[in-house]
Interface confidence: medium
């Protein structure tokens, strides 16, 4: 069957970060906004502690992706944007006694945007 | 004071596994604010990092190692391990361990502590 | 990955002189979110571990005279020594810490005339 259609961004974390319409089912399996929305409040206390500026963009790339009527796929951040926000949030996560994600993990994310591997750039 | 002091085997074949253990002592490896990791240097060579483990297992590995590396820690025997495979002649080297401090405050974030560092010979 | 590069890569200094070491970096050490530089300073002496001398671009490491300063921004990066000891003799490296794998250069030596 066909892609779903984009929607709109509704998760107030994920609003006003540059792109506006989403896809489900996103990066993780989530078939919703809300019940992604419920996971990523999870990561709210990291994000407001301004660990790394890319993190709340980064997490919304794979909770509520980009999506364009283009492109049949969601399309997550690359994989540079996900090393520098675990590099500089990781530590943080350590000192609460949380390890980083393996939901999150960097190296399922493309190297670089290129035609085949569609990813956003910081 | 915090004491790092590697231990395993010197001698180690062509193709097989090298393995490598460090012992903390003088605090607790569960510490907050620190990674702990493995650096190695070949002979009259430079320093090299090869990856790095939290309290928790989370990994950072380097890209040109990743493949055959594996690194673990043990925080009821307060130590962490390093597990190389499918050595060659090139990973002869001083094989160092480190802490790596983390000020979650300012950021600041160095190699602070190191163990006196062990040579490996791969050789057959 | 990041490319740091030494110059000179040995150095011979009369003791009571100024020495200076350059680290130069592929890419920016500074990380734009916090204002840190992401450059430290290691010393190894002759058959030990190395020790860390500065970090984040000038602080000085517990323990360090204040006779070692270290100082530059983005890419290009320096090591004073103002007045050198005997006991400052081995191999200095930079690293930086900015971005995985973190990486050294390939270290400066210093020896005593």
């Known amino acids: 069957r066909g892609a779903a259609p984009c929607q709109a961004v509704e998760i107030p974390m994920c609003r006003g970060i540059g792109y506006n319409l989403t896809r489900m089912p996103n990066l993780l399996g989530h078939t919703s906004q809300g019940e992604a929305a419920a996971e990523l409040a999870e990561f709210a206390p990291l994000v407001q502690y301004g660990c790394h500026s890319h993190l709340r963009f980064f997490l919304c790339s794979l909770y509520a992706p980009m999506c364009t009527d283009q492109v049949s796929t969601p399309i997550p951040a690359c994989r540079p944007m996900c090393e520098q926000a675990r590099l500089r949030c990781a530590p943080i996560m350590e000192q609460f006694n949380f390890g980083w994600p393996d939901s999150l993990d960097c190296a399922r994310l493309p190297t670089r945007n290129d035609p085949h591997a569609l990813c956003m750039e910081a | 004071q915090l004491q790092l002091q590697e231990s395993g085997s010197g001698l180690v074949k062509p193709s097989q596994t090298l393995s490598l253990t460090c012992a903390v002592s003088g605090g607790s490896i569960s510490s907050g604010g620190y990674s702990w990791s493995w650096i190695r240097q070949p002979p009259g060579k430079g320093l090299e990092w090869i990856g790095s483990?939290?309290?928790?297992?989370?990994?950072y590995y380097n890209p040109s190692l990743k493949s055959r590396l594996t690194i673990s820690v043990d925080t009821s025997k307060n130590q962490f391990s390093l597990k190389l495979s499918s050595v060659t002649a090139a990973d002869t080297a001083v094989y160092y361990c480190?802490?790596?401090?983390?000020?979650?405050?300012?950021?600041?974030?160095?190699?602070?502590?190191w163990g006196q560092g062990t040579l490996v010979t791969v050789s057959s | 990955d990041i490319v740091m590069t030494h110059t000179p890569l040995s150095l011979s200094v009369t003791p009571g002189e100024p020495a200076s070491i350059s680290c130069r970096s592929s890419?920016?050490?500074?990380?734009?979110?916090?204002?840190?530089?992401?450059l430290d300073w290691y010393l190894q002496k002759p058959g030990q571990s190395p020790q860390l001398l500065i970090h984040t671009l000038s602080h000085r490491a517990s323990g360090v005279p204040d006779r070692f300063s270290g100082s530059g921004s983005g890419t290009d990066f320096t090591l004073k020594i103002s007045r050198v000891e005997a006991e400052d003799v081995g191999v200095y490296y930079c690293m930086q810490s900015i971005q995985l794998p973190w990486t050294f250069g390939q270290g400066t030596k210093v020896e005593i005339k």
């Open positions: 483990i939290y309290h928790s297992g989370s990994t």
């Open positions: 890419r920016s050490l500074l990380d734009t979110d916090d204002g840190n530089t992401y």
């Open positions: 480190a802490r790596f401090y983390y000020d979650i405050l300012t950021g600041y974030s160095y190699f602070d502590y």
